[in-house]
């Protein structure tokens, strides 16, 4: 039977001779050279050689356990003379014994990690891992221990796990953002003589909102013309915040000051500046300077940092309103004046007033816009704004005169303003009433006395306050011996009545009847109108059948025969 146990061979042999492995030996071997030993299998004849007489095995090359830890070979012992095996072929193992010839190697040459600034001590950052190719089952060749070579006192590493943690309180990104940490992994449990490897860990502190916004100055001053429309930007202010990104976002607001209602502040969404804008129309003459208290605050605040103080800051903004030369302002938006139509030329109707609203209070001169008074009926005193007539008026021609008055700054003619002036012409009884139409009527030859042959109506261009009251009568020269009578109906109408029974058209074909119409106003106005009455032949119903042709061409005028 074979006489051997497992063979062990130390790796990485560096001697000058072949490395002795062990001896194959059969108890049939009497030492007389009659047996021959043969080796086959992993590396036989190349890595491993055997002395066929003695059975001694040697390794011809330096072996690396990490490359191949076990070799499986087969042994034979045969009788040289007969060539027959004296032992059955048997498998045996050469196990390569580990030495500490491999240093730990990290899974990454460079690690990148982040951790929030101001983290508590012991906050996990990243875990690094190193592996050692040596035999973990034998000795400490592969027992890795981690340590920090660079990066203290900021970070620490757990020796067994490779977990990197923060080691210093209140690490501030605004102070230092980047850290390069060097970690060593050493085998042999970290003991002397152990092999080591290193890796670099680049650690970036990420931002947290641990800084409030701060105005670089306590007071800002801007100017804006009083003419700036609402929405106009008038200046920019900027609070700085040492944080970044969302933590550096700033909201601006006006918290106090007389300009609270007059101005607004918005945040420029890109530059994070505060833009002061006009909210309402300004007036230099009312207020020349405004003071605002503007606050800058972080919209997103981390409660754990509130102990550092409020996450806001305020500054005073002084806004100077600049005077803009404004046109004169009339005391009214429109003027309504009245004047009697019988007013003499140069009669004063009333006056307008305009003032320069500017602090300078420049004097103004007045004028009438002649496009609105082409006939030059009115004029104005350029100095005091008195309006007076320059022509006679007639209410019956034009009741309202709509003119425009201009006020112009004497020192700056470009600055002018206009106001409408509505002048009402008041009625005076200067028109006599007259017939509403031309009256030409007829009377039947067989008419009876007191028969109504025509109703008269009158009109008057005047417009008396209490309404028209007309009276009608026959003209004095026709009143006596007239063939007709006038009956005043007291309702601004009158009737013509026959005064006798029967008329003869052959005797008198046409009567001209003069009628006096008077009004009831002061001074009384009257006129005389003529009514033409033709005598006609009529049927028994009183319908006209024929009249004298002369009547159609008879001149109008007074007829003594009426």
């Amino acid at each position: 039977s074979w006489m051997w146990n497992q063979f062990f061979l130390l790796e990485e042999y560096t001697g000058s001779d072949y490395q002795y492995v062990g001896k194959l030996h059969s108890d049939q071997d009497r030492g007389d050279g009659s047996l021959k030993y043969i080796l086959s299998g992993d590396g036989a004849g190349d890595l491993f050689i055997i002395n066929e007489n003695t059975g001694d095995i040697q390794a011809t090359k330096r072996l690396d356990r990490e490359e191949k830890p076990v070799y499986i070979l087969r042994a034979q012992a045969i009788n040289r003379r007969t060539g027959r095996p004296v032992e059955p072929e048997s498998e045996f193992i050469i196990k390569i014994h580990d030495i500490n010839d491999n240093e730990p190697i990290f899974t990454k040459e460079v690690y990148t990690a982040t951790v929030p600034e101001m983290s508590d001590v012991g906050t996990f950052v990243v875990q690094v891992t190193a592996t050692d190719a040596d035999d973990p089952t034998y000795g400490n060749s592969a027992k890795v221990v981690y340590s920090i070579l660079q990066g203290q006192p900021y970070f620490s590493v757990e020796s067994e796990t490779g977990i990197i943690k923060t080691a210093l309180l209140n690490m501030d990104r605004e102070n230092r953002e980047q850290y390069q940490v060097v970690i060593q992994a050493k085998d042999m449990g970290g003991q002397m003589g152990g092999l080591s490897g290193t890796t670099t860990v680049n650690i970036t502190l990420t931002d947290v909102n641990d800084n409030p916004p701060r105005f670089p100055q306590s007071t800002y001053q801007f100017k804006t013309p009083e003419s700036s429309p609402p929405g106009t930007p008038i200046g920019r202010i900027k609070a700085s915040d040492a944080d970044v990104g969302e933590n550096a976002e700033i909201e601006y607001s006006i918290t106090d000051g007389e300009g609270l209602d007059m101005f607004d502040v918005i945040t420029d969404q890109e530059t994070q500046e505060g833009i002061i804008t006009v909210k309402k129309l300004l007036d230099f003459e009312k207020k020349k300077v405004y003071t605002l208290k503007v606050e800058a605050s972080n919209p997103y605040v981390e409660p754990r940092f509130l102990y550092l103080g409020p996450f806001k800051d305020s500054a005073t903004v002084r806004i100077v309103v600049e005077d803009v030369d404004e046109p004169p302002v009339f005391s009214k938006l429109a003027y309504i004046l009245q004047i009697r139509e019988d007013a003499q030329i140069n009669t004063t109707i009333g006056s307008v007033t305009a003032q320069d609203p500017d602090a300078a209070r420049n004097p103004v001169k007045y004028s009438v816009d002649r496009h609105t008074d082409m006939d030059r009926i009115f004029n104005i005193d350029s100095g005091n704004g008195s309006i007076f007539t320059s022509k006679l008026l007639d209410r019956e021609t034009l009741l309202w005169h709509n003119i425009t008055v201009i006020a112009t700054e004497i020192n700056n003619p470009k600055q002018s303003s206009r106001v409408p002036l509505y002048i009402k012409v008041l009625d005076v009884n200067d028109n006599a009433p007259e017939f509403a139409e031309f009256y030409e009527t007829f009377v039947c030859e067989k008419a009876k006395a007191d028969q109504l042959i025509q109703t008269l109506h009158a009109v008057d261009k005047d417009d008396p306050y209490s309404g028209h009251q007309f009276s009608f009568s026959l003209a004095p020269e026709a009143a006596s011996g007239s063939n007709f009578t006038i009956q005043d109906n007291k309702d601004n109408t009158a009737g013509i009545l026959t005064r006798k029974n029967g008329y003869n058209r052959h005797e008198m074909s046409t009567y001209l009847l003069p009628v006096v119409i008077s009004d009831n106003d002061y001074p009384v106005q009257s006129s005389t109108g003529t009514v033409t009455v033709r005598v006609c032949a009529c049927d028994h119903h009183g319908n006209m059948q024929s009249c004298h042709a002369e009547a159609l061409i008879h001149p109008t005028g007074l007829s003594t025969g009426a």
Epitope: P230, P233, I266, D268, Q269, E270, T271, I275
Partner: antibody, heavy 121, light 107 residues
């Protein structure tokens, strides 16, 4: 005077690409976020993309309908805005406007004349 | 995403009329973030009212804006012939969104 002039529009087949440019002048380009807005024929306005300023790392935002197909970019040294349009679809047919916000980067105050992109086979 | 709904979608009115267009947001927004635009056929949109209330440069005073939270309004006090156009509201929170538009036509 603020001026925005778009170019690069034209006829392209579905699946094709096109690059629009916008030349800006009359204002400080570097302080404004910039946008592309489009309008399909006879339809309403649709925002396409926005790019922020350098301070904000040139952050970009897109409408869902163009995400992963369109890329907005800017060249501050040339006062120029770009829109790279890939994998074009027929529904991308529209007039594309280059638009600058108002002061404070609110609203869309200044619009170019637009450039027509037609996607058709 | 914040949706904006304009009403009415279209509107017929006469010169001199007072017109109101409303814009309703699906969730509350700051008045700073709501704006109104006018667009005429074949033209680029024009900023009309910014930050809910403020008239853009050159915009006549007959235009006004109001509102807060989720409800905003554009008012034209006395329509002029040049006001017939399409009006859009828009909000600033990414993704920026527009209302569907209100077409104002001559009656």
């Amino acid at each position: 005077e603020v001026q925005l002039v778009e170019s690069g529009g034209g006829l392209v087949q579905p699946g094709g690409s096109l690059r629009l440019s916008c030349a800006a002048s009359g204002f400080t380009f570097t302080t404004y976020a910039m946008n592309w807005v489009r309008q399909a024929p006879g339809k309403g306005l649709e925002w396409v993309a926005r790019i922020r300023i350098k301070n904000n790392n040139y952050a970009t935002y897109y409408a869902d309908s163009v995400t992963d197909r369109f890329t907005i970019s800017r060249d501050d040294s040339k006062n120029s805005l770009y829109l790279q349009m890939n994998s074009l679809k027929t529904e991308d047919t529209a007039v594309y406007y280059c638009v600058r916000p108002d002061y404070g980067n609110y609203g869309l105050a200044y619009w170019g004349q637009g450039t027509l992109v037609t996607v058709s086979s | 995403d914040i949706q904006l709904t304009q009403s009415p979608s279209s509107l017929s009115a006469s010169v001199g009329d007072r017109v109101t267009i409303t814009c309703s947001a699906s969730s509350s927004i700051s008045s700073h973030y709501l704006h109104w635009y006018q667009q005429k056929p074949g033209k680029s949109p024009k900023l009309l009212i910014y930050r809910s209330f403020y008239l853009a440069s050159g915009v006549p005073s007959r235009f006004s804006g109001s509102g807060s939270g989720t409800d905003f309004t554009l008012t034209i006090s006395s329509l002029q012939p040049e006001d017939f156009a399409t009006y859009y509201c828009q909000q600033d929170i990414v993704p920026l969104t527009f209302g569907q538009g209100t077409k104002l036509e001559i009656k």
